[in-house]
């Protein structure tokens, strides 16, 4: 014959534990029912009566089967730099994440405690590491033969256009200006790579090959003056 099913509350066999969705009440010394998510224990069990559960009040929740006397309070409303990606319900807490153009500078168990705007790289510098939900943008100087003329959290250094005849050589913050109506070749935007190790303009570190996708115009003409965003200021 099958074993008789015990109904809560019941005294567990010595050495055994209560079943799933039950808990052991130390006072009653009985296995009692837990309350379902979205509820809490209004009245704890006794030797003769089971747990009495009640729904969570507005702005409170329980996410798990529980026997807590009060539901947890939902987190405060999302700040202006955040968006609510999960609403506060009886069964789940509110989750706030950073809005586009921001990243989480200080996270909490779920969502974000403090958002910060993504760094914008100034002209002469490009995005070397894009921002993520939890990390800021990293900017790096544009390599010779590349430039960025924007202040942006997304723009990378782009290759200078290559001219038949150069009117104004490009630098780190400005594209080359051609005298002819159109350049002989301009690198496709899709071919651009993020900044990489390059030889220093001042030639004080070990030279390394320039990125193949960002050829310097220096094989056509001498390098132009120092770039605006990283130029020289001697007398």
């Amino acid at each position: 014959l099958p074993a008789q099913v015990a109904f809560t509350p019941y005294a567990p066999e010595p050495g055994s534990t209560c079943r799933l969705r039950e808990y052991y009440d130390q006072t009653a010394q009985m296995c009692c029912s837990k309350c379902s998510p979205g509820q809490h224990a209004k009245v704890f069990c006794t030797k003769t009566s089971d747990t009495v559960c009640d729904s969570c009040e507005d702005s409170t929740y329980t996410q798990l089967w529980n026997w807590v006397p009060e539901c947890l309070s939902c987190g405060s409303r999302c700040s202006s730099d955040q968006v609510e990606t999960q609403a506060c319900t009886r069964e789940q807490n509110r989750i706030c994440t950073c809005r586009p153009g921001w990243y989480c500078a200080l996270s909490k168990q779920e969502g974000c405690r403090l958002c910060a705007p993504l760094r914008k790289c100034r002209p002469g510098f490009g995005v070397a590491r894009p921002g993520t939900e939890t990390s800021d943008v990293v900017c790096k100087p544009c390599a010779p033969g590349t430039f960025s003329n924007t202040t942006s959290s997304t723009d990378i250094c782009r290759p200078h256009q290559i001219c038949n005849v150069v009117a104004i050589p490009g630098n780190a913050s400005m594209d080359a200006v051609c005298t002819s109506t159109s350049p002989t070749r301009s690198m496709a935007p899709g071919a651009v790579h993020l900044p990489q190790p390059v030889s220093t303009r001042s030639q004080h570190t070990q030279p390394t090959p320039e990125p193949s996708t960002a050829p310097s115009t220096s094989f056509l003409l001498p390098m132009g003056p120092s770039p605006p965003a990283e130029g020289s200021t001697g007398d």
Partner: antibody, heavy 119, light 106 residues
Framework: QVQLVQSGAEVKKPGASVKVSCKAS????????IHWVRQAPGQGLEWMGW????????DYADKFKKRVTMTADTSISTAFMELSRLRSDDTAVYYC????????????WGQGTLVTVSS | DIQMTQSPSSLSASVGDRVTITCQGS??????LAWFQQKPGKAPKLLIY???SLQTGVPSRFSGSRSGTDFTLTISSLQPEDFATYFC????????FGGGTKLELK
Amino acid sequence: QVQLVQSGAEVKKPGASVKVSCKASGYTFTDYIIHWVRQAPGQGLEWMGWIDPDYGNTDYADKFKKRVTMTADTSISTAFMELSRLRSDDTAVYYCARDDASPLVMDAWGQGTLVTVSS
Amino acid sequence: DIQMTQSPSSLSASVGDRVTITCQGSQNIDNYLAWFQQKPGKAPKLLIYSTYSLQTGVPSRFSGSRSGTDFTLTISSLQPEDFATYFCFQYNQGYMFGGGTKLELK
């Protein structure tokens, strides 16, 4: 918190070289460039150059191009500035400052290193 | 190279005064101008960057403005701790500091 701690004061003879260090802490060293700025006694601030510690790329002011070398050791989060062929008018306080290449520039500085050039 | 002409080179004022310091660029530098405060024996401290933006922790009595290539630092009501030397700094084309303005107690 962000800190840039520089090496101690130096006294050098004309013609010698000096190497000043700048140890960074409290942030990711390779995510910022390091500028070097100097200030002669009673004078204004003078930009010398910067180094990107990540790749070792540098950019120097024309005035210092032939005499300055900026390096960095990422393993110890330290930037170095070496100035050679010292003259008496190189007597100054030398500062390092970090820069994230955004519009927010030089938001943290070292305490400065006094270099005295005297025979 | 872009030159930054800062004026006046020195200035006497009293606590509570409104003070303005100007910097003129020899050519266009967009908004890439910062202001630093320096006290004797100390490193410079960033006050304002990108012409108008107040650095975190800097009192709101400091403000920056621009008219063409003329840039202004204004201290709305001088406090005793504001007596120091102020430098402008352009970082659009190369890097160049202004000559400095020493703000002294009248």
